[in-house]
C-alpha cells in the first residue's frame, strides 16, 4: 500500500520519477513497460496460441466505462477469460495509453526503440488462485495483461465502440454504459505471434506480478479516432478550477538487464509478395 494516499500523475512533481517515494515497487524489480529489441528476444516453441473465451460480449448487457483520472477504463465480465496459460486468467478491465496531438506516440511498450501511437491493455487475474483482481494484483502469478500496439491508419469500427462514448466520461469520476461487443475484434491479426515476459503494472503501485503478452502485430485506428482519444478527456473532476488534459499517460520504458523476452515466433518477418511480378 502507498505510504501517503494515492496521488500520482504522469507529469509534474507527482510524475513517474516520484512514484517510488510512495510506491516502492515502482523503483524495484521486473518493471514495465520495456523496449522490445532483438538482442533480448528468444524464440520459445512452447508459447502456443492463446484462446480468448467469453470475449464476445452481448450487446444486451451493459459494461461500465470510467474515467479514473489516469485513463479510460472498461469493466469486463468475470466469465471472460484466457485459456492457454498455466492457470485460468479472468478478465477484469481494459484501458488505453496514448500521447498528445502534437506528438502522437504514446504506447508504453516500444519496439526497437520506436513508440506506437497508443496501446491497449486487457487486464486479467488468476481466478484459479484468487477471488478477484485486487486480491491477485500483489500476488505471484496474479495478473496477465494482453497488450495491443496501436498505430495510425484506417478507421477501426471496433475501437469506435469505446471511443463513441468518450464524451460521457470527459471528467474524472464520470461513468457511462457501453453495450457489449466482441472484445476479440480489438486484437490484431495473427494473435499467435506475441512477445512474453514477466513484468509489472505500468502504473502505481507497480506490482511486479504481471505476465505480459504483447502482440507482435499492431492494429490501426484513424487519425480522427486517435485525436478524439487525445483530446476528449481530463484527469480532473468536472468542477476542478484547474483542469488538466488527459494526455501522455504512458510510462517510460524501464531497464531490462540480464533478462529475456520470449517470442512465440521466430524473428524473421516474412515479407508479402505484393507488388512483385
Amino acid at each position: 500500500a502507498p505510504v501517503n494516499g494515492s496521488k500520482w500523475t504522469y507529469f509534474g512533481p507527482d510524475g513517474e520519477n516520484s512514484w517510488s517515494k510512495k510506491y516502492p515497487s515502482c523503483g524495484g524489480l521486473l518493471q514495465s513497460p520495456i523496449d522490445l529489441h532483438s538482442d533480448i528476444l528468444q524464440y520459445d516453441a512452447s508459447l502456443t496460441p492463446l484462446e480468448f473465451q467469453g470475449y464476445n460480449l452481448s450487446a444486451n448487457k451493459q459494461f461500465l466505462l470510467t474515467n479514473n483520472g489516469h485513463s479510460v477504463k472498461l469493466n469486463l465480465p468475470s466469465d471472460m477469460h484466457i485459456q492457454g496459460l498455466q492457470s485460468r486468467y479472468s478478465a477484469t478491465q481494459l484501458h488505453l495509453h496514448w500521447g498528445n496531438p502534437n506528438d502522437p506516440h504514446g504506447s508504453e511498450h516500444t519496439v526497437s526503440g520506436q513508440h506506437f501511437a497508443a496501446e491497449l491493455h486487457i487486464v486479467h487475474y488468476n481466478s484459479d488462485l484468487y477471488p478477484d483482481a485486487s486480491t491477485a494484483s500483489n500476488k505471484s502469478e496474479g495478473l496477465a495483461v494482453l497488450a495491443v500496439l496501436i498505430e495510425m491508419g484506417s478507421f477501426n469500427p471496433s475501437y469506435d465502440k469505446i471511443f463513441s462514448h468518450l464524451q460521457h466520461v470527459k471528467y474524472k469520476g464520470q461513468e457511462a454504459f457501453v453495450p457489449g461487443f466482441n472484445i476479440e475484434e480489438l486484437l490484431p491479426e495473427r494473435t499467435a505471434e506475441y512477445y512474453r515476459y514477466r513484468g509489472s503494472l505500468t502504473t502505481p503501485p507497480c506490482n511486479p506480478t504481471v505476465l505480459w503478452t504483447v502482440f507482435r502485430n499492431p492494429v490501426q485506428i484513424s487519425q480522427e479516432q486517435l485525436l478524439a482519444l487525445e483530446t476528449a478527456l481530463y484527469c480532473t473532476h468536472m468542477d476542478d478550477p484547474s483542469p488538466r488534459e488527459m494526455i501522455n499517460n504512458f510510462r517510460q520504458v524501464q531497464k531490462f538487464d540480464e533478462r529475456l523476452v520470449y517470442t512465440s515466433f521466430s524473428q524473421v518477418q516474412v515479407c508479402t509478395a505484393a507488388g512483385l511480378s
Epitope: 464524451q167 457511462a176 454504459f177 453495450p179
Partner: antibody, heavy 121, light 106 residues
C-alpha cells in the same frame, strides 16, 4: 411469455433489512441483466443496481453502495435484492426489470408487478 | 449525476388535444427513453431511442430531441392516454429518470 415476478415485500422496522426476490421465466435467463428500480409513494423512479446472471457481476448506483446487495441463483432463475439499515425514506415499491438492446442502446422492455416495502415502527 | 427535469409536472387536457411533454437533461445524452405508468401498475416502455415507439404504442405518440432537450408529443389525446410519463437516460452512470409528468383529464 416473458415474466418477472417480485416477492418479499412487507413491513420492516427502521434499521432492519429486506430481501426481495425476482423470479424470471419465458426467456434465456443469463442473456439479460436484471435491474432493480424503486418508486417511493407518489414519487419518481430510482435505479438501485443490476446483476449479470451469467456470472454474478454487479453494478450499483453509488447512492446505494454498501447498503444494497444484489445476488442471483441461476438454478432458480431468480435475482435477489438485500437492503440493510432501512429508514422511512426506503419505503417504496421495488421493481425488477430487464433491459433489451435494440440497435443503439437499451430500454426496459419487461417489468415485474412490483412489491411494496414499508419501513415503519 | 445527470439530472432529468420534466415539464410540466402535471397537465390537464381534453380528449383530442395535442399534448407536449419536455424532458431536459443537465448534460447531453445520446438518447432519451420514455415510459408510461398508470396508478398501481408497473411502468411500460413507450418510446425508446428518442423517437422509436415500443411495440403496441399508437402512432399518435411521437418523440424527438437531441443533446439536452427532448419531447414526447401526443397528437390527439385519447382516454387511455391519461397516465404519468417518465423520461430516462442511459448515457451516464447512474442511469436516471425524470420526476414524471402526470396527464390528467380536464
Amino acid at each position: 411469455e416473458v415474466q418477472l415476478v417480485e416477492s418479499g415485500g412487507g413491513l420492516v422496522q427502521p434499521g432492519g433489512s429486506l430481501r426481495l426476490s425476482c423470479a424470471a421465466s419465458g426467456y434465456s435467463y443469463t442473456d439479460y441483466n436484471i435491474y432493480w428500480v424503486r418508486q417511493a409513494p407518489g414519487k419518481g423512479l430510482e435505479w438501485v443496481g443490476y446483476i449479470d446472471p451469467a456470472n454474478g457481476d454487479t453494478t450499483y448506483n453509488q447512492k446505494f453502495k454498501g447498503r444494497a446487495t444484489i445476488s442471483v441463483d441461476k438454478s432458480k432463475n431468480t435475482a435477489y435484492l438485500q437492503m440493510n439499515s432501512l429508514r422511512a425514506e426506503d419505503t417504496a415499491v421495488y421493481y425488477c426489470s430487464r433491459p433489451i438492446y435494440y440497435g443503439a442502446y437499451w430500454y426496459f422492455d419487461v417489468w415485474g408487478q412490483g412489491t411494496l416495502v414499508t419501513v415503519s415502527s | 449525476d445527470i439530472q432529468m427535469t420534466q415539464s410540466p409536472s402535471s397537465l390537464s387536457a381534453s380528449v383530442g388535444d395535442r399534448v407536449t411533454i419536455t424532458c431536459r437533461a443537465s448534460s447531453p445524452v445520446t438518447y432519451m427513453h420514455w415510459y408510461q405508468q398508470k396508478p398501481g401498475k408497473a411502468p411500460k416502455p413507450w418510446i425508446y431511442a428518442t423517437s422509436s415507439l415500443a411495440p403496441g404504442v399508437p402512432s399518435r405518440f411521437s418523440g424527438s430531441g437531441s443533446g439536452t432537450d427532448f419531447t414526447l408529443t401526443i397528437s390527439s389525446l385519447q382516454p387511455e392516454d391519461f397516465a404519468t410519463y417518465y423520461c430516462q437516460q442511459w448515457s451516464s452512470n447512474p442511469l436516471t429518470f425524470g420526476q414524471g409528468t402526470k396527464v390528467e383529464i380536464k
